[in-house]
Interface confidence: low
């Protein structure tokens, strides 16, 4: 028989001690110690160097504490792919950079995806004809501006349509082609600070004899040597709050799945051997689950409706964990920082 | 009613099927993409450069493909606490190095598990009583060496009891104490390499009075003022498998939570827009949980025993999941290198 | 070998006019900008003008705007300076030379040069 | 216009002698920076471009550095065909200018 009033509340009480009790096994397991390290109030005082070092682990690190998380912070996209290379193939250039419908090559296309990642590396790379005997080559990348009226014939070179941003001397031996690569890092920058200044650019490789021996038509013929750009990326993996699980409070009325608050304190539990945090917010799961409701993994529910032999039903379990960091005394007097994983539940699901 | 032969294989083939399709949603869904992108094979032979970046990354990375994983191979250990930072107090020096009782200080006890880290970065901070006036202090840190027979009076120092490793001229102006750090990454190098080598230091810091500043003195009276050593240390987290969860066949009997081999094919689905892998191994949950039986969290069996309103009890459901990394085109015909990160079942548990 | 070979130099009186050439052989010439500098006795070097490899672009340096014209003829590979209104202070050596890039006329350094050619405006 | 500037206007050294050459812009150029040298009565030829990439055919005891405002021109050991006028010229911006030049003479 469940008391008036809250009929959930005895079972959350309950779990809440329960969890309690298997933090402080966990984290004796996590570090690896058998027992509580003996280290009263008194011997802390004594052992504790009042230096630079600790204060700086104090100041630098953070130890949770009461601080106060923001409703709406910013937490890592654990879920969606995270790109690392992208390789954009050179397309046609805008007809306004066209003079007689050329250069038709090359135009690079960036999504405003990767033009928010930060750009790591950047080459672009050109494919070069076989010359039949060792040449120098002199390879040009002229950066493509639309034609205006002013500077055309004369003027103080206002309206030049190419402005050359790469050059390179190259010495070509091999009787087969080569792949020559073109740091592009810069350019790269100045054209994702300001797209629309990226018209694409002209590319020249030209032996002594005047020939161009750069792969730049986009017709067939050339499949798999056109010039190509290669981009290592690293993303900002943060993203605004996704809220894949319920939270709730003491007084919360809710029975399914949920997040329930839980501070623990150490200085409660006289583990003076702890220097910090003295309290972290560690928090539960409680709570009923349904087929459908919150699972971690999207195809779960799929599984378990023709699932005869498994559970009755998917259950109330932590889906996303963090760490804490630590500052103790071992249980050979030195001191340790250090991070223990898995002790704040940040997310309840249903799996 | 059940097929003879077999009562869970009908379950279980049902189960692969739903994570087959659950994968392909997923990937999806991950790579931001609304639908497989419409690239046949013809166009990723046309599209795809026949150069050294993308050989690269076939070359580097590991697409798991149908790579063998080692029965024992090292995994991460995600459960105990990962060091940091170690301070380690000075203690009495052995007798073997004392004449007179003296020096008492300094020796600093490292554990073996600290001697197997990569030390990043090791330093001896001393404290320096305060001087009335400027003054320029001559420290020195001198190892200790337990007294021979030979060379005690004179002789070729052969039986020298004191080595100077570091010297250190400062120039004091406080006329409050003062922290002084000595880099010690050296001597701790040669140390974590012969531990017998390490029988302590002696610490002297004299001022043109020939007065020693250095608080060594290891009694009362100069709590918190003592020598100590902090060392950042790069934790070594692969460990040995730790079996925390069951894997098994086909044609296995298990009816426990348990972890099966699945391998998603990407040719077989006919998508021609993913580069590499052209398959690899994704696994897949299945089986029945009890209690006591494997859970993710040690104290998780306390919490549902106790709980009248939760699910009927845990269930089976992937208590790690990696990453793979795939190379592929997307819907705007670039290439993409990256990681989608839970797409393969390391362990099954009951949580 | 690349060559460049000037004609056209003499001594004009001031306010007439000369035309200078610079025959190309050895290279493309029609993938390359060309230019003109020249040297007065004694002195540094100045940059007179470039014209894009297919004629479509020139630039001039101050000194020489709306006086000067610089024009090719790629199918002769000879590169021109049409000079008129000329002053004493135009007295120099002229030099044609090859832009080492092709295409549009970039501002470049010049590689290999003409043997230079001597105008001398005197009355 | 950028105005270059070469320091000193004459260098008087001795054959093997270590010879430095300074070239100094009004504003930044980057590395877009030649170096010529040029004898009595000849056109200029072509040593450094990009600030210190060497022509083709250029001894490797001509060498170029700097970047910006600053470069400097060094042969390492002086030749006797190696005494003559060196200029500088930027290409960093329109219209192309050089430096004065410096004179490397017989001491």
């Known amino acids: 028989p469940e008391p008036d009033g809250c009929p959930v509340c005895v079972w959350r009480q309950h779990s809440r001690e329960l969890r309690l009790e298997s933090i402080k096994s966990q984290i004796l397991s996590k570090l690896r110690l058998k027992e509580a390290p003996n280290i009263s109030r008194e011997v802390v005082k004594q052992l504790l160097p009042k230096a630079p070092p600790l204060q700086q682990i104090l100041d630098l690190h953070d130890f949770q504490g009461d601080a106060l998380q923001p409703e709406d912070f910013l937490e890592e996209d654990e879920y969606h792919a995270t790109t690392e290379t992208v390789i954009s193939m050179a397309q046609e250039t805008d007809p306004a950079v066209q003079t007689d419908g050329s250069p038709l090559c090359c135009h690079f296309h960036f999504s405003p995806k990767v033009m928010f990642t930060k750009v790591l590396k950047a080459q672009l790379w050109v494919y070069l004809r076989p010359v039949p005997r060792p040449a120098t080559v002199y390879l040009q990348i002229l950066r493509l501006k639309p034609l205006t009226g002013e500077g055309t014939a004369g003027g103080g070179g206002g309206g030049r349509r190419h402005i050359r941003i790469r050059s390179l001397k190259i010495e070509l031996h091999s009787r087969s082609g080569h792949w020559q690569s073109i740091d592009f890092k810069q350019v790269l920058h100045s054209w994702f600070r300001q797209p629309q200044s990226n018209w694409g650019i002209e590319i020249n490789a030209f032996d002594p004899s005047g020939t161009d021996l750069a792969v730049t038509s986009l017709g067939p013929g050339a499949e798999g040597l056109h010039p190509f750009m290669e981009l290592r990326v690293l993303e900002n993996t943060k993203r605004s709050r996704r809220n894949l699980g319920l939270d709730c409070d003491e007084h919360s009325s809710e029975s399914r799945c949920c997040r329930y608050p839980l501070t623990v304190d150490f200085e409660a539990f006289g583990w003076d051997w702890i220097i910090a945090p003295k309290r972290y917010k560690a928090n539960y799961c409680s709570g009923q689950c349904e087929y459908m409701f919150m699972q971690k993994y999207p195809h779960t529910h799929l599984v378990q409706q023709a699932n005869p032999r498994g559970s009755a039903g998917p259950c109330c379990t932590p889906t996303k964990m963090s760490p804490i960091n630590m500052l103790y005394f071992n249980d050979k007097q030195q001191i340790i920082y250090g991070k223990i994983p898995g002790m704040v539940v940040d997310r309840c699901g249903c799996s | 009613p059940e097929p003879d032969g077999c009562p869970v294989c009908v379950w279980r083939q049902h189960s692969r099927e739903l994570r087959l399709e659950s994968i392909k949603s997923q990937i999806l869904s991950k790579l931001r993409l609304k639908e497989a992108p419409n690239i046949s094979r013809e166009v990723v032979k046309q599209l795809l450069p026949k150069a050294p970046p993308l050989q690269q990354i076939l070359d580097l990375h590991d697409f798991q493909g149908d790579a063998l994983q080692p029965e024992d191979f090292l995994e991460e250990d995600e459960y105990h606490a990962t060091t940091e930072t170690v301070i380690s107090m000075a203690q009495e020096t052995d007798p073997a190095v004392q004449t007179d009782g003296s020096p008492l200080c300094c020796h600093f006890h490292f554990s073996p598990k600290v001697m197997f880290t990569k030390v990043l970065k090791a330093q001896l901070w001393v404290y320096l009583r305060p001087v009335p006036r400027p003054a320029t202090v001559y420290l020195q840190i001198l190892r200790l060496k337990p007294l021979t027979g030979e060379g005690t009076a004179g002789g070729g120092g052969g039986g020298r009891r004191h080595i100077r490793i570091r010297s250190l001229k400062i120039e004091l102006h406080s006329r409050s104490g003062h922290w002084q750090s000595i880099d010690f990454k050296q001597v701790l190098h040669s140390w974590f390499r012969q531990p017998q080598s390490n029988w302590g230091i002696e610490i002297n810091a004299f001022d043109p009075s020939g007065t020693d500043l250095a608080v060594t003195s290891l009694g009362p009276g100069a709590e918190g003022l003592h020598p100590f050593m902090e060392l950042r240390v790069l934790e070594n987290t692969k460990r040995s498998r730790r079996n925390l969860g069951l894997d098994c066949d086909e044609h296995s009997s298990e009816s426990r939570c348990c972890r099966y081999p699945l391998t998603v094919d990407f040719e077989a689905f006919g998508w021609d827009w993913i580069i590499a892998p052209k398959r690899y191994k994704a696994n897949y949950c299945s089986g029945q949980c009890e209690y006591m039986f494997m859970q993710k969290y040690p104290h998780t069996h306390l919490v549902q025993q106790a709980n009248p309103r939760g699910s009927a009890g845990p269930c089976c459901t992937p208590t790690k999941m990696s990453p793979i990394n795939m190379l592929y085109f997307n819907d705007k015909q670039q290439i993409i290198y990256g990681k989608i990160p839970g797409m393969v079942v390391d362990r099954c548990g009951c949580s | 070998q690349v060559q460049l070979v000037q004609s056209g130099g003499g001594v004009v009186q001031p306010g007439r006019s000369l035309r200078l050439s610079c025959a190309a052989s050895g290279f493309t010439f029609s993938s390359y900008a060309m230019h003109w500098v020249r040297q007065a006795p004694g002195k540094g070097l100045e940059w007179v003008a470039v014209?894009?490899?297919?004629?479509?672009?020139?630039y001039y340096a101050d000194s020489v705007k709306g006086r000067f014209t610089i024009s090719r003829d790629n199918s002769k590979n000879t590169l021109y300076l049409q000079m008129n209104s000329l002053r004493a202070e135009d007295t120099a050596v002229y030099y044609c030379?090859?832009?080492?890039?092709?295409?549009?006329?970039?501002?470049?350094?010049?590689?290999?040069w003409g043997q230079g050619t001597l105008v001398t405006v005197s009355s | 216009e950028i105005v270059m500037t070469q320091s000193p206007a004459t260098l008087s050294l001795s054959a093997g002698e270590r010879a430095t050459l300074s070239c100094r812009a009004s504003q930044s150029v980057s590395n877009y920076l030649a170096w010529y040298q040029q004898k009595p009565g000849q056109a200029p030829r072509l040593l450094i471009y990009d600030a210190s990439n060497r022509a083709t055919g250029i001894p490797a005891r001509f060498s170029g550095s700097g970047s910006g405002t600053d470069f400097t021109l060094t042969i390492s050991s002086l030749e006797p065909e190696d005494f003559a006028v060196y200029y500088c010229?930027?290409?960093?911006?329109?219209?192309?200018?050089f430096g004065g030049g410096t004179n490397v003479e017989i001491k």
């Open positions: 010229q930027q290409y960093g911006s329109a219209p192309l200018t």
């Open positions: 014209i894009s490899y297919d004629g479509s672009n020139e």
């Open positions: 030379a090859k832009d080492f890039w092709s295409g549009y006329p970039q501002y470049n350094w010049f590689d290999p």
